[in-house]
Interface confidence: medium
């Protein structure tokens, strides 16, 4: 009764299609698979960025897999062939591992790469990234930004740079069609006549870096003798009402400061007839139903009631 063996996949490699971190892991079938023609051979793939403690594990029948990686670090992967127990009349058979690595040969010392990279997706409409030049780089150093997300045929270079002293220090992106809820990859590389410049790679999802506009049309309405309803409208733009959280700051008679976070465009405030002055401001942020993270908007313009009976007047800014 001969022991059943299976070979590992052939030509296992990590292929960089030029998408700034979105890599293909590819392999060829093992030799001598024809013995198992009636059987679905599977592959167990493990991969990670070098330095990560955990492996991602995938079991697939395909000969390729795609995922995003941090190209600032190396990548390691390993794969083996699996013969399910149905193929072997017994227990699952595994081949030995085939292993591969991939990294981009770094140019320049780490200090030459851009510093303090910051990207904000203003009002879910306009992406702007800014950075500071690397430490100790000369004025002849210029940085170039490239970006890619699934849907683009190839990585694109920024066409509208923000400049300071002749150096690129940021990028205003064009309209980015169908670019949210997927990984957005950026590489900022550089060139200098004096020394090589280290490239930097960044990955994020646009919906997680949205900074909305502040809410507008703040109003007061007296609901009862002891309640005032504060209302406002969602900011103009593409973000639907269901995607907002709000933070309100309310000041009564220059003494009491109320801070509250709410999900709707209203807030009911308990007050007294003695209230002589009421002011509030609101800011907005994309909520957990639409993103994993976000940036608070600027505060709205202040809306105040002063010296008049709130029961007689609704104030509209």
């Amino acid at each position: 009764d001969t022991e059943i063996k299976v070979n590992p996949p052939q030509d296992f490699e990590i292929v960089d299609p030029g998408y700034l971190g979105y890599l293909y892991l590819q392999w060829q079938p093992p030799l001598s698979l024809d013995h198992f023609k009636e059987c679905t051979v599977e592959y167990e793939l493990k991969y990670r960025n070098i330095g990560s403690e955990t492996w991602k594990t995938i079991i697939t029948k395909n000969l390729h897999y795609k995922d995003g990686f941090d190209l600032n670090k190396g990548i390691e992967a390993k794969i083996h062939t699996l013969l399910p127990w149905q193929c072997t009349n017994g227990s699952e058979v595994q081949s030995s591992w085939a292993e591969t690595t991939y990294w981009i040969s770094p140019q320049g010392i780490p200090e030459t790469k851009v510093q303090d990279m910051d990207c904000v997706y203003y009002n879910w409409q306009y992406l702007l990234c800014s950075w500071k030049p690397g430490i100790g780089v000369l004025l002849d150093t210029n940085y170039n930004l490239f970006y890619w997300y699934e849907g683009l045929d190839h990585a694109l270079q920024c066409v509208d740079y923000i400049k300071a002293d002749g150096q690129n220090i940021g990028c205003r992106f064009p309209y980015l069609e169908a670019s949210d809820y997927k990984d957005f990859y950026i590489c900022v590389n550089g060139s200098s006549e004096n020394k090589p410049i280290r490239s930097s790679y960044f990955t994020f999802q646009l919906q997680n870096i949205v900074k909305p506009l502040p809410p507008v049309y703040l109003t007061f309405t007296r609901e009862s003798s002891c309640e005032i309803k504060l209302k406002w409208s969602i900011p103009l733009g593409p973000i639907p009402a269901r995607c907002f959280d709000y933070e309100i700051e309310i000041r009564e008679d220059d003494t009491t400061l109320v801070t509250a976070t709410v999900e709707n465009e209203t807030y009911t405030l308990k007050t007294t007839n003695e209230t002589r002055q009421l002011c509030f401001v609101v800011r907005s942020k994309v909520n957990i139903y639409c993103s994993d993270d976000g940036i608070w908007s600027e505060w709205s313009d202040k809306q105040c009631w002063e010296g008049e009976d709130l029961s007689k007047k609704t104030l509209l800014r």
Epitope: Q10, D11, E13, I14, V15, D16, P17, Y24, Q26, Q28, P29, L31, S32, L33, D34, H35, K37, V41, K61, L63, H64, T100
Partner: antibody
């Protein structure tokens, strides 16, 4: 339409060099291994070299090892064959061929270019 | 290296004939054999891979069989456009060698 177009062939003297190119279109080039296969006038097919999809794995026929170099540029959808120290017996039509791949099989050639003629003669 | 020995080297047949071409590998290659058709002045065209799997668009009159060392390409009813040279190739392990070819001519 899936297409492979070879170029770079011509007449070269023995000991000379030539670089063949193959432009691929109509498929995701970086997903397939690629090969060069040649055919001497009036003779059969001879496999020359293969490069894997990412370029990490390269295989040569003994008859060209050390003289020919296969390479690819996935960004340009191009395959190359650098031929040095050419001999009269290298005279052939050189075909660029895509490596077909199925779940159980690989290394057969499912798409071929039209070929480019290399003549090595003094 | 694995050698592929093809026979016959040529044959004459008429339209409608059943034609069989054989290929023998010098060692066991499982089912890793492909068959190609080539017409004068043209590039080869894949017919069969993995011994018996027809490539996309190949007519059903072409079939392949065999495993181990002995393989067969059969054309069940020869058509005028089938007059050409046929090659086998093993796709088991490098180097990937071809048979010497079989020229199918009009009788």
């Amino acid at each position: 339409e899936v297409q492979l177009v070879e170029s770079g062939g011509g007449l070269v003297q023995p000991g000379g060099s030539l670089r063949l190119s193959c432009a691929a279109s109509g498929f995701t080039f970086s997903r397939n291994g690629m090969s060069w296969v040649r055919q001497a006038p009036g003779k059969g097919l001879e496999w020359v070299a293969t490069v894997s999809s990412g370029g990490s794995y390269i295989y040569y026929a003994d008859s060209v090892k050390g003289r020919f170099t296969i390479s690819r540029d996935n960004a340009k959808n191009s395959l190359y064959l650098q031929m040095n120290s050419l001999r009269a017996e290298d005279t052939a039509v050189y075909y660029c061929a895509r490596q077909g791949t199925t779940a159980l099989a690989t290394r057969f050639f499912d798409v071929w270019g039209q070929g480019t003629l290399v003549t090595v003669s003094s | 290296d694995i050698q592929m020995t093809q026979s016959p080297s040529s044959l004459s047949a008429s339209v409608g004939d059943r034609v069989t071409i054989t290929c023998k590998a010098s060692q066991d290659v499982g089912t890793a054999v492909a068959w190609y058709q080539q017409k004068p002045g043209k590039a080869p065209k894949l017919l069969i891979y993995s011994a018996s799997y027809r490539s996309t668009g190949v007519p059903s009159r072409f079939s392949g069989s065999g495993s181990g060392t002995d393989f067969t390409l059969t054309i069940s009813s020869l058509q005028p456009e089938d007059f050409a040279t046929y090659y086998c190739q093993h796709h088991y392990s490098a180097p990937w060698t071809f048979g010497g070819g079989t020229k199918v001519e009009i009788k």
